[in-house]
């Protein structure tokens, strides 16, 4: 009886793993083996595919074959017993085009209210992605184990930190890789779970802001407790994209090591032009906080994005605020050559209840005020460009009293 050729051959490539699967065309015939040949583009001869000769099952692995992954190849298969079937030719394919990105390797670290995720490609020194290793980005899905409500985070790099979590809570997540340059989306990693720690005695510093004063940067932050010492560290932001060895060499800012106030001042020339990450940690001598959230600090923008200067004209039920260009040292106005929006915060002097107005215009009305009442106003500028997404620090608060009734005209 003539043997039939195997049918429905599927080629699965995940990272550097090349797997072939096929269907037996005749289940009734026992002790059949299968063999593959391959042919490279531009070649006439067929070569035996090592790892896929005389196979008794309907699956084989030809990962050991050192192929040029960008070169088209053709495969053929036949069945063998005493005689052989005719060859069945598989459509030619380019391994790189066909390849899927495998699940990445994931390691987790826990803090009390944060999780650090370290991600690396599932196949070390992959041949398939050798030219693209630096281009991987990742996305993840995270959920509280108890609730299952998922949150997606896109476009992250090989180390990512998720903040604002709850202490002593188990979070689960899965991660997949993408090569946006090749329109490839990978498969998810297995689910990894980790429990955040008990709440730390010392919270991390919050609300870190950088401003420019004369030739110095002024770094300010908020802290819950008094009598603390703080240290500030910096890192080149581009290193976060580097899938290298997961060791980020954060550096001390010398003037911000063991400072006893919630601010520190250091010369602008500490940083060359570039984008940096900054973080702050608190210590009381016995205990140390976890690091604050990292803030992005762009020397180019920071140097120019100063808090706005404004004048207030007081009426009985409103303030008219006129925003002008900020002044540098020497009282010269700064030319801001990119569009800004202004955030104006005002409050009654005797109250903590703040109200906020966001405006693109440089003349702003603050309505619904009470007559003969002292209100305080502060403002800051934001860049409108999403990529830059920078904010100045708030200006100093200016307090004014509204006029007596009926002066709104």
């Amino acid at each position: 009886k003539n043997l039939k050729s195997p049918q429905k051959v599927e080629v699965d490539i995940i990272d550097d793993n090349f797997i072939l699967r096929w269907n037996r065309s005749d289940e009734s015939v026992g002790n059949v083996t299968f063999s593959f040949d391959y042919q490279k583009t531009g070649m006439d001869n067929w070569i035996k595919l090592s790892g896929c000769q005389n196979i008794t099952s309907t699956k084989c692995n030809f990962s050991s074959l050192k192929l040029n992954v960008y070169e088209e190849i053709k495969l053929r298969i036949r069945a063998e017993k005493e005689n052989t079937s005719s060859w069945y030719e598989v459509d030619s394919f380019t391994p790189f085009r066909k390849a899927q990105i495998g699940p990445p390797e994931v390691h987790l670290e826990a803090e009390d209210k944060a999780i650090v995720i370290h991600i690396s490609p599932g196949t070390k020194d992959s041949v398939m992605w050798a030219l693209d290793g630096l281009s991987f980005t990742y996305s993840l899905v995270i959920w509280k184990n108890s609730s299952g409500v998922e949150e997606r985070i896109e476009n992250i790099y090989s180390r990512h930190k998720i903040y604002k979590l709850s202490p002593e809570t188990t979070y689960c997540l899965k991660v997949k890789a993408a090569l946006l340059t090749s329109w490839k989306i990978g498969v998810y990693s297995p689910v990894h779970c980790i429990k955040t720690t008990v709440e730390n005695e010392l919270p991390p510093p919050e609300n870190i802001e950088v401003s420019v004063q004369n030739q110095n940067y002024v770094l300010k932050w908020d802290y819950t407790y008094a009598n603390m010492t703080f240290q500030v560290q910096w890192l080149h932001a581009f290193l976060k994209r580097n899938p290298g060895n997961h060791l980020y060499k954060w550096k001390q800012i010398p003037d911000c090591e063991n400072v006893k106030t919630t601010q520190c001042v250091f010369p602008q020339n500490v940083f060359q032009k570039g984008i940096y990450l900054l973080r702050v940690q608190a210590s009381d001598g016995n205990n140390t906080s976890f690091w604050s959230e990292e803030i992005k600090f762009d020397t180019e923008i920071q140097a120019f994005l100063l808090p706005p200067v404004f004048n207030i004209r007081s009426l009985s039920d409103s303030f008219h605020i006129y925003i002008g260009a900020p002044k540098q040292s020497g009282n010269t106005p700064v030319i801001q050559d990119y569009p800004l929006i202004y955030e104006i915060i005002f409050w009654e002097n005797t109250s903590n209840a703040e109200r906020k107005i966001i405006e693109k215009k440089t003349d702003v009305t603050v309505p619904n005020l009470k007559p003969l009442t002292v209100y305080c106003v502060k403002a800051r500028a934001h860049t409108m460009d999403e990529k830059l997404n920078k904010s100045s620090v708030f200006s100093d608060a200016v307090c004014e009293k509204t006029k007596p009734g009926n002066t709104s005209k």
Partner: antibody, heavy 118, light 107 residues
């Protein structure tokens, strides 16, 4: 493969200095920190400090501050630990180790015994 | 400085037994704890990093758990080559510190 090979045993007099070397191979020393840990006979491990070979930034344990100097020569992939004003209780084994972020101290040298004796 | 205590300080056990060593830190160190095994005259051998991850080549009978201030090293079935001293190590903040060690010997 990754290796840290330390210099040989030394005998020193009290008050003298000793300089122990740690030669790295199988990785770029600039990409990691090199830590130094010591161990007295029959005792536990004691962290002395670390150096970033890329820019020579150091952190020392307060106990050794002022007496220890860590340096590195990246051209020959070697880190050094010098301890001055030696006392008899500095008779210990000194280890160098590679620090790899959350992987901690993932490779160690074989250790160097320094004996301080008059 | 972050203090580290380990218990027990020594432990006599038999091949095949399950052994647990605990380590306490004087403050929350997240999951920045590693474990090392040391045999006489040898350098420490890394076993566990980041609380629960085994280094490559470390047998699966070794496992780590915990977070915050309480950490555990477990050997599920002690083998003859496991008789050694075990150290925990915090690398959360400088100066880094080690536990005093737990000596595992044959009963």
């Amino acid at each position: 493969q990754v290796q840290l090979v330390q210099s040989g045993a030394e005998v020193k007099k009290p008050g003298a200095s000793v300089k122990v070397s740690c030669k790295a191979s199988g990785f770029n020393i600039k990409d990691y920190y090199i830590h130094w840990v010591r161990q007295a006979p029959g005792q536990g491990l004691e962290w002395m400090g670390r150096i970033d070979p890329e820019d020579a930034e150091t952190k020392y344990a307060p106990k050794f501050q002022g007496r220890v100097t860590m340096t590195a020569d990246t051209s020959i992939s070697t880190a050094y630990m010098e301890l001055s004003r030696l006392r008899s209780d500095d008779t210990v084994v000194y280890y160098c180790a590679r620090y790899h972020g959350y992987w901690a101290l993932d490779y160690w040298g074989q250790g160097t015994l320094v004996t301080v004796s008059s | 400085d972050i203090q580290m205590t380990q218990s027990p300080s020594s432990l006599s056990t038999s091949v095949g037994d399950r052994v647990t060593v605990t380590c306490k830190t004087s403050q929350n160190v997240g999951t920045n704890v590693a474990w090392y095994q040391q045999k006489p005259g040898k350098a420490p051998k890394p076993l566990i990093y980041s609380t629960s991850y085994r280094y490559s080549g470390v047998p699966s009978r070794f496992s780590g758990s915990g977070s915050g201030t309480d950490f555990t090293l477990t050997i599920s079935s002690v083998q003859p080559e496991d008789f050694a001293t075990y150290y925990c190590h915090q690398y959360f903040s400088y100066p880094y510190t080690f536990g005093p060690g737990t000596k595992l010997d044959i009963k």
